[in-house]
Interface confidence: low
């Protein structure tokens, strides 16, 4: 039902209610008589200056003479309403103040209001390479000869030959040489939506060029590559031969959700198939730093470890919400999950055996495994005080660094040791 309230619903409070949720609803307080009718009601939606708050009115019927709803944001003149506007209001600049005022002596005559708000378009991407195992490592570690991912994917596809072992590029029978210029979008290989095995090899190229200097995130939401097929993601506008190869995907990547983050504001995605390939290909999305896909949510200020640092560095999908893995640096995607009390994080995905266990922020990334599956010690953007962050995003005790014995799985606690500590 379109009017059904599915977001947090905020009553009138004094002093003004500060709303920290990314989305919610507001309504005029129920009034029985003039004595219980508040003269003023103010809500403050907190956001950063990069955000836009969208206000959608399910209902707005106020008595225009005595009732009024005003909306104020930093980059917008004051908006005063007593009837619903024809389309949603988009208020840029972050903080939005919504005030309901009533100047009458008796109970208000209008039918009241019901609105929903949502905060959109906040995202910054990190200069990282995403491994096939979903870990993130610094982009400078790509093709540096060291397995920083732990699964070797940061060193895969680093051949000087951009298309090793692939046949010459033929003219594709289906249109697939595409330039995409939007801030975000969806694209897929020609056979993905209508499976059709082609008798000859295919070569397709997508140039992602939003005319924006910020980096891109390319997310392969579905991968079904045939044996011998490949997808290559290159940084910059191409041609591939002169561009930096960021990632190569083969049939070994099938079934994985892979995200590639570019170093520049452009990318080329090349898709190559062998004759009679049995793969469907891929479906992918891309977006510019500063924008989330419409169906994703922005990471933001949460109560998790590291809140206040690296805010809004990512977006997360509905599938990544409450799955036990921190996709946001501050754990926004794992906050307020079913089965966990406020301020706790789930060990595993909702509905899994580990989902009933919940942990506090203090239990995260402290080299003391709390969750049975170790979820509290994975994907650590930060470590608790007294701990050292390994390159593989796990934490070990700081006192164990450079003691001559590797404690990180990748041995990174023994790298860059300018001196050797005496053995205890």
């Amino acid at each position: 039902h379109p009017d059904r309230i599915i977001f947090p619903n905020h009553a009138c409070e004094d002093p003004p209610a500060v709303l920290l949720e990314v989305q919610g609803t507001l309504q005029r307080p129920l009034v029985r008589d003039s004595r219980t009718s508040p003269a003023n009601c103010t809500w403050l939606i907190l956001g950063s200056k990069e955000q836009t708050v969208t206000i959608r009115f399910q209902k707005l019927h106020l008595a225009c003479g005595s009732e009024r709803l005003t909306l104020r944001s930093p980059l917008q003149p004051l908006i005063s309403l007593c009837e619903a506007p024809p389309s949603p209001l988009q208020l840029p600049g972050g903080n939005v103040t919504i005030t309901y005022s009533y100047a009458g002596a008796r109970a208000p005559m209008g039918q009241g209001f019901l609105l929903s708000y949502s905060q959109d378009w906040l995202m910054c991407l990190q200069e990282e390479f995403q491994c096939l195992n979903h870990r993130c490592v610094s982009a400078v570690q790509r093709c540096d000869g060291v397995d920083a991912c732990g699964d070797g994917s940061d060193e895969a596809g680093c051949s000087s030959d951009p298309f090793p072992g692939l046949t010459p590029r033929p003219v594709p029978s289906l249109p697939c040489n595409v330039t995409l210029e939007d801030f975000y979008g969806v694209f897929s290989s020609p056979g993905y939506t209508h499976l059709a095995s082609v008798s000859h090899p295919q070569s397709c190229h997508w140039l992602l060029d939003p005319h924006d200097g910020r980096r891109l995130a390319v997310r392969f939401t579905a991968l079904d590559l045939g044996f011998g097929d490949a997808v290559h993601v290159y940084d910059g506008p191409g041609p591939p031969e002169s561009s930096r190869l960021l990632r190569s995907l083969t049939h070994f990547s099938n079934g994985k959700a892979v995200t590639v983050e570019t170093l520049s504001g452009q990318a080329v995605v090349s898709y190559h198939t062998v004759a009679w390939s049995n793969g469907r290909g891929f479906n992918a999305t891309y977006h510019v730093r500063g924008y989330c896909l419409p169906w994703d949510r922005p990471c933001g200020l949460g109560s998790g470890l590291g809140a206040g640092e690296g805010l809004g560095e990512r977006c997360y999908s509905e599938a990544q919400r409450c799955d036990g893995s921190w996709d946001c640096a501050d754990g926004t995607d794992e906050e307020d999950c079913p089965g966990c009390p406020p301020g706790h994080f789930p060990c595993g995905a909702a509905g899994t055996s580990g989902a009933t266990a919940c942990y506090l922020p203090a239990d995260r990334c402290n080299y003391q495994t709390f969750c049975a599956d170790g979820a509290d010690e994975r994907r650590c953007r930060h470590c608790q005080p007294g701990n050292f962050r390994c390159r593989d995003e796990k934490c070990v005790y700081e006192t164990w660094v450079c003691d001559g014995q590797p404690d990180c799985a990748d041995g990174s606690d023994e790298w860059d040791c300018s001196y050797v500590l005496p053995r205890k």
Epitope: P175, N177, V178, T179, L180, E181, D182, F183, Y184, G185, V186, F187, P210, H211, D212, G213, P294
Partner: antibody, heavy 116, light 107 residues
Framework: EVQLLESGGGLVQPGGSLRLSCAAS????????MSWVRQAPGKGLEWVSQ????????TYADSVKGRFTISRDNSKNTLYLQMNSLRAEDTAVYYC?????????WGQGTLVTVSS | DIQMTQSPSSLSASVGDRVTITCRAS??????LNWYQQKPGKAPKLLIY???RLQSGVPSRFSGSGSGTDFTLTISSLQPEDFATYYC?????????FGQGTKVEIK
């Protein structure tokens, strides 16, 4: 050869509606974002709206937001602009343009006159 | 919104002259700027994109330069067919915005 052919313009009263069409040929229409740009008589160019390859995202200039709707039918290689609640200030030549940002091909334009 | 300001609004020149038109953005747009030419009664035509890259089929007498907030379109030797109105446009931020135009007339 790339061709964009607008149609649907004409005289309409304030508050009225019009639907503009843009028939595309000579390129793979479904592979490109498309845009509408308008030009009031004797004035400069004003971007109106754009639409992504698969019908999303759609974005609008503030001056038309809530009144105009951009859409596309990739099977017919056609771009549309539904214009409602038209105002005198919407009087202009409306061009459809290939791509979302860098308008490398334009139609010849269709004139929309809003007058009582 | 990013405002684009062109100067001059109009200029008179003779065939063979070197003509320079400037465009200023209200905030940095890196090298993301497009230039268009429009003749009376005709649709605009893309000349330059990414500040300095010549669109296919455009004569080499047209060139563009600049980055950040200040950009220039130069016609090295004005030809009769170049008398038109020229617009700059920023493609980096929604809403996309154009300059007000520079009309190049025959002296």
């Amino acid at each position: 050869e790339v061709q964009l052919l607008e149609s649907g313009g004409g005289l309409v009263q304030p508050g009225g509606s019009l639907r503009l069409s843009c028939a595309a040929s000579g390129f793979t229409f479904s592979s490109y974002a498309m845009s509408w740009v308008r030009q009031a008589p004797g004035k400069g160019l004003e971007w109106v709206s754009q639409i992504g390859t698969m019908g999303r995202p759609t974005t609008y200039a503030d001056s038309v937001k809530g009144r105009f709707t951009i859409s596309r039918d990739n099977s017919k290689n056609t771009l549309y602009l539904q214009m409602n609640s038209l105002r005198a200030e919407d009087t202009a030549v409306y061009y459809c343009a290939k791509s979302g940002k860098k308008f490398d091909y334009w139609g010849q334009g269709t004139l929309v006159t809003v007058s009582s | 919104d990013i405002q684009m300001t062109q100067s001059p609004s109009s200029l008179s020149a003779s065939v063979g002259d070197r003509v320079t038109i400037t465009c200023r953005a209200s905030q940095s747009i890196s090298s993301y700027l497009n230039w268009y030419q429009q003749k009376p009664g005709k649709a605009p035509k893309l000349l330059i994109y990414r500040a300095s890259r010549l669109q296919s089929g455009v004569p080499s007498r047209f060139s563009g330069s600049g980055s950040g907030t200040d950009f220039t379109l130069t016609i090295s030797s004005l030809q009769p067919e170049d008398f038109a109105t020229y617009y700059c446009q920023q493609p980096t931020s929604l809403p996309l915005t154009f300059g007000q135009g520079t009309k190049v007339e025959i002296k």
